[in-house]
C-alpha cells in the first residue's frame, strides 16, 4: 500500500491552524495514528506528541479507494513560546510502519508577527500576527 | 446496543438560529459518521451531511451550506446541527443516523428518534 | 449529483401478495444503494445493504437486487406490517441522497 503524510497551515484571525494530513486506503487504517510534534527531532512518538489522532476506516462513501484523515492542531494565538521545529509523523501499531512528514518551522519575530517555513504545499507562508492577514 | 438520543421539539421564531443535539451511546463515537436528516411532513427524506467525529470532517449538500453547521464533542459522544436564519420551510423533523462501517453495513444502521423543529411567528 | 428516481410512487396491494419496487439511478453506483422501510411516525430502519445483502431482524420476505444504474426491492407475500413508505439511497459518492420514496398502502 502506498500511505502519503503531507502538512499544511492555515490562519482564521489570530487562530493559527497546523495540519496533517494522510491519504491512505481503508484496509491500511487499522491501527494506525497520525500525530503532530514539537521539537522532537529523534523520538517523535504519538507519547511526546503534542495532538494524535487514529486514521479513519471509513471515508463515509463507497465510491473511493482512498481515504484522508486530517489532524489539525489549532493555536489561538501564536507567542515566542510556540516557535520551534514541527512534524507531522504517523505510526503503525499492528506493522510498525512510520511515516515522517517534512520539518516546518514556527519563527515568531521581534515585531510581534510570525512566519512559517518549510511547508511542502507552499514553501513559505508569513502571517502577520496583528493584523491577521496572510501576507 | 446502540442508541442515538436526539433533543426534545423545538420552537423556534423566524431569522431565529437553533442547535440540536444527538447523544450517541454503545459504540465508539469517533468511528463512525454521523449523518443529518430533514423530513418535512408528508414528505421524503433529504440528506443535510454528515460528520465524522474522530477528525471533525464534515460533509454537506449544496443546499444547506451556510444554512446547517454540523459539530461533534467527542467527550459527550454528542453530535449536534446548527440551523440558522431560520425560516418557515426549516419546520421539519430532523434525524440523526449513524453510517454502518464500509463495506460491512454502509447504509444508516441506527437512527435517532427524530426531532421536530416548528418555525413560527 | 447521483438522482435516484424510485416508482411506482405508490403501490396499492392485498396482503398475501408480493411486489416489487423499483430505484434508478441517474449514474452508475455500483452495488452502492441502500433501502429503508419508514411508517408513519417512525424513524426509517435500514432493510437492505449494498442493494442485495440481508440485514439481521428484517423478515427473509424482503430482498433486494441490482447493480449499476437499476435496483429492486421486492417483497415475498406482503403483511399488514408492511404498509408504509420506503426509501433508496445511495452512498457512492458525496452528497450522499434518497430517492423520493414509494408508498405502499392497502388495496
Known amino acids: 500500500g502506498c500511505i502519503n503524510i503531507t502538512s499544511s497551515a492555515s490562519q482564521e484571525g489570530t487562530r493559527l491552524n497546523l495540519i496533517c494530513t494522510v491519504w491512505h486506503k481503508k484496509e491500511e487504517a487499522e491501527g494506525f495514528v497520525v500525530f503532530l510534534c514539537k521539537d522532537r527531532s529523534g523520538d517523535c512518538s504519538p507519547e511526546t506528541s503534542l495532538k494524535q489522532l487514529r486514521l479513519k476506516r471509513d471515508p463515509g462513501i463507497d465510491g473511493v479507494g482512498e481515504i484522508s484523515s486530517q489532524l489539525m492542531f489549532t493555536i489561538s494565538q501564536v507567542t515566542p513560546l510556540h516557535s520551534g521545529t514541527y512534524q507531522c509523523c504517523a505510526r503503525s501499531q499492528k506493522s510498525g510502519i512510520r511515516l515522517q512528514g517534512h520539518f516546518f518551522s514556527i519563527l515568531f519575530t521581534e515585531t510581534g508577527n510570525y512566519t512559517v517555513t518549510g511547508l511542502k504545499q507552499r514553501q513559505h507562508l508569513e502571517f502577520s500576527h496583528n493584523e491577521g492577514t496572510l501576507s | 446496543q446502540v442508541h442515538l438520543q436526539q433533543s426534545g421539539a423545538e420552537l423556534a421564531r423566524p431569522g431565529a438560529s437553533v442547535k440540536l443535539s444527538c447523544k450517541a451511546s454503545g459504540y465508539t463515537f469517533t468511528d463512525y459518521w454521523m449523518q443529518w436528516i430533514k423530513q418535512r411532513p408528508g414528505q421524503g427524506l433529504e440528506w443535510i451531511g454528515s460528520i465524522y467525529p474522530g477528525d471533525d470532517d464534515a460533509r454537506y449538500t449544496q443546499k444547506f451550506r451556510g444554512k446547517a453547521t454540523l459539530t461533534a464533542d467527542k467527550s459527550s459522544s454528542t453530535a449536534y446541527m446548527q440551523l440558522s436564519s431560520l425560516a418557515s420551510e426549516d419546520s421539519a423533523v430532523y434525524y440523526c443516523?449513524?453510517?454502518?462501517?464500509?463495506?460491512?453495513?454502509?447504509?444508516?444502521?441506527?437512527w435517532g428518534q427524530g426531532t421536530t423543529l416548528t418555525v413560527s411567528s | 449529483d447521483i438522482v435516484l428516481t424510485q416508482s411506482p410512487a405508490t403501490l396499492s396491494v392485498t396482503p398475501g401478495n408480493s411486489v416489487s419496487l423499483s430505484c434508478r439511478a441517474s449514474q452508475s453506483i455500483s452495488n452502492h444503494l441502500h433501502w429503508y422501510q419508514q411508517k408513519s411516525h417512525e424513524s426509517p430502519r435500514l432493510l437492505i445493504k449494498y442493494a442485495s445483502q440481508s440485514i439481521s431482524g428484517i423478515p427473509s420476505r424482503f430482498s433486494g437486487s441490482g447493480s449499476g444504474t437499476d435496483f429492486t426491492l421486492s417483497i415475498n407475500s406482503v403483511e399488514t406490517e408492511d404498509f408504509g413508505m420506503y426509501f433508496c439511497?445511495?452512498?457512492?459518492?458525496?452528497?450522499?441522497?434518497f430517492g423520493a420514496g414509494t408508498k405502499l398502502e392497502l388495496k
Open positions: 443516523a449513524r453510517r454502518g462501517i464500509a463495506a460491512v453495513v454502509g447504509g444508516f444502521d441506527y
Open positions: 439511497q445511495q452512498s457512492n459518492s458525496w452528497p450522499l441522497t
